[in-house]
């Protein structure tokens, strides 16, 4: 079941998924001046069985000015740093992200990929928030959001994070010792 909306926006914060649940779709978007190859996939799909998950389909871009198709290329690390996931810059991936059963890791970039990735998340997906450079995190609770389904509708839980304008950044889980998330009823929800 796809989530109806995007994760909530927190002022001066970005979010990312550590891993993607099976059923997640990633649009095959190309940067300006390029387009999907004819008969190319519209999206990549995280699929798998009980033991292994991976991305089905390949995204391929070609120049809008030519008919040539382009081959799959994995860019160098410095190119990779420029990539964005949905609404955010994608920092280094934690090594344990693929250990979650039923989840795919971040798919490698493809040549001439658009600078922003558009994911279509599924129920149960969790994303984590951090404050952008120059802002400090004030935690009232978990700095994460989960897409859940209730009453036949999907919604994202509201992350309990405030980013204040002080020079200190919080980290995504896996980039530093993660903070324990207190259990309990969220103070509010974001309805989709």
């Amino acid at each position: 079941e796809l989530c109806d909306d995007d994760p909530p926006e927190i002022p001066h914060a970005t979010f990312k998924a550590m891993a993607y649940k099976e059923g997640t779709m990633l649009n095959c978007e190309c940067k300006r001046g390029f387009r999907r190859i004819k008969s190319g996939s519209l999206y990549m799909l995280c699929t798998g069985n009980s033991s292994h998950s991976s991305w089905d389909n390949q995204c391929q871009c070609t120049s809008s000015a030519t008919r040539n198709t382009t081959k799959q290329v994995t860019p160098q690390p410095e190119e990779q740093k420029e990539r964005k996931t949905t609404e955010m810059q994608s920092p280094m991936q934690p090594v344990d992200q693929a250990s979650l059963p039923g989840h795919c890791r971040e798919p490698p970039p493809w040549e001439n990929e658009a600078t922003e990735r558009i994911y279509h998340f599924v129920v149960g997906q969790m994303v984590y928030y951090q404050c952008v450079q120059g802002y400090r995190a004030l935690h009232r609770g978990p700095a994460e959001s989960v897409c859940k389904m209730t009453h036949g509708k999907t919604r994202w839980t509201q992350p309990q994070l405030i980013c204040t304008g002080e020079m200190e950044t919080s980290q995504f889980p896996g980039e530093e010792k993660p903070q324990a998330s207190p259990e309990g009823r969220p103070e509010s929800e974001t309805s989709c």
């Epitope: 859940k148 389904m149 209730t150 009453h151 036949g152 009823r185 969220p186 103070e187 509010s188 929800e189 309805s191």
Partner: antibody
């Protein structure tokens, strides 16, 4: 304090339509979903549908599809449930209920008794 | 539709008794279960949400637990005010209620 006040009891003839109102106070009306639940005499609770009080998006139980319409008027913080083509087995108490932060129904209206009889 | 099977339908108990009501879902509902108390002529009152979270203002003698698709409401020591009908409700998919359990005086 949160209150949901429903319209009064009604007696209807088979084939007629029914419209029950539910006026909300004590909270931001557009911040919550409103649900409708009914209870036939001596029977259990039966969910009918919900409306997103902000966007107006709505969903209905399959049993009532085509007969029920849920609407809202944000200017007066009121939700409405209309049921058409009434039958005698629609005789019930009709409740509106607010979906709270825990996703369950934390506040209920007092109920509207509806009798469908020829 | 997800079916909720509640048992027993009637339960006779005395003040001070420990009372347990069970609800079984026909498929996984991911902890999205609530318990309500209803008294004659009144609207239901929320006791427990998300299987085990106690609603604000509800006495701590009420508790909820889950094991797979089986959910339990426990009243640790029955009080005179607790004689009522109790309903479970799943709200993972479109909402459905159990058929109710009437707790009556033995």
């Amino acid at each position: 304090q949160v209150q949901l006040v429903q319209s009064g009891a009604e007696v209807k003839k088979p084939g007629a339509s029914l419209k029950v109102s539910c006026k909300a106070s004590g909270y931001t009306f557009t911040g919550y979903y409103m649900h409708w639940v009914r209870q036939a005499p001596g029977q259990g609770l039966e969910w009918m549908g919900w409306i997103n009080s902000n966007s107006g998006d709505k969903r209905y139980a399959q049993k009532f599809q085509g007969r029920v319409t849920v609407t809202r008027d944000t200017s007066i913080s009121t939700a409405y449930m209309e049921l058409s083509r009434l039958r005698s087995d629609d005789t019930a108490v009709y409740y509106c209920a607010r979906e709270g932060a825990g996703d369950a129904f934390d506040f209920w209206g007092q109920g509207t008794m509806v009798i469908v009889s020829s | 539709d997800i079916q909720m099977t509640q048992s027993p339908s009637t339960l006779s108990a005395s003040v001070g008794d420990r009372v347990t009501i069970t609800c079984r879902a026909s498929q996984s509902i991911s902890s999205w279960l609530a318990w309500y108390q209803q008294k004659p002529g009144k609207a239901p009152k929320l006791l427990i949400y998300k299987a085990s979270s106690l609603e604000s203002g509800v006495p701590s003698r009420f508790s909820g637990s889950e094991s797979g698709t089986e959910f339990t409401l426990t009243i640790s020591s029955l009080q005179p005010d607790d004689f009522a009908t109790y309903y479970c409700q799943q709200y993972n998919s479109y909402s459905t209620f159990g058929q109710g359990t009437k707790v009556e005086i033995k």
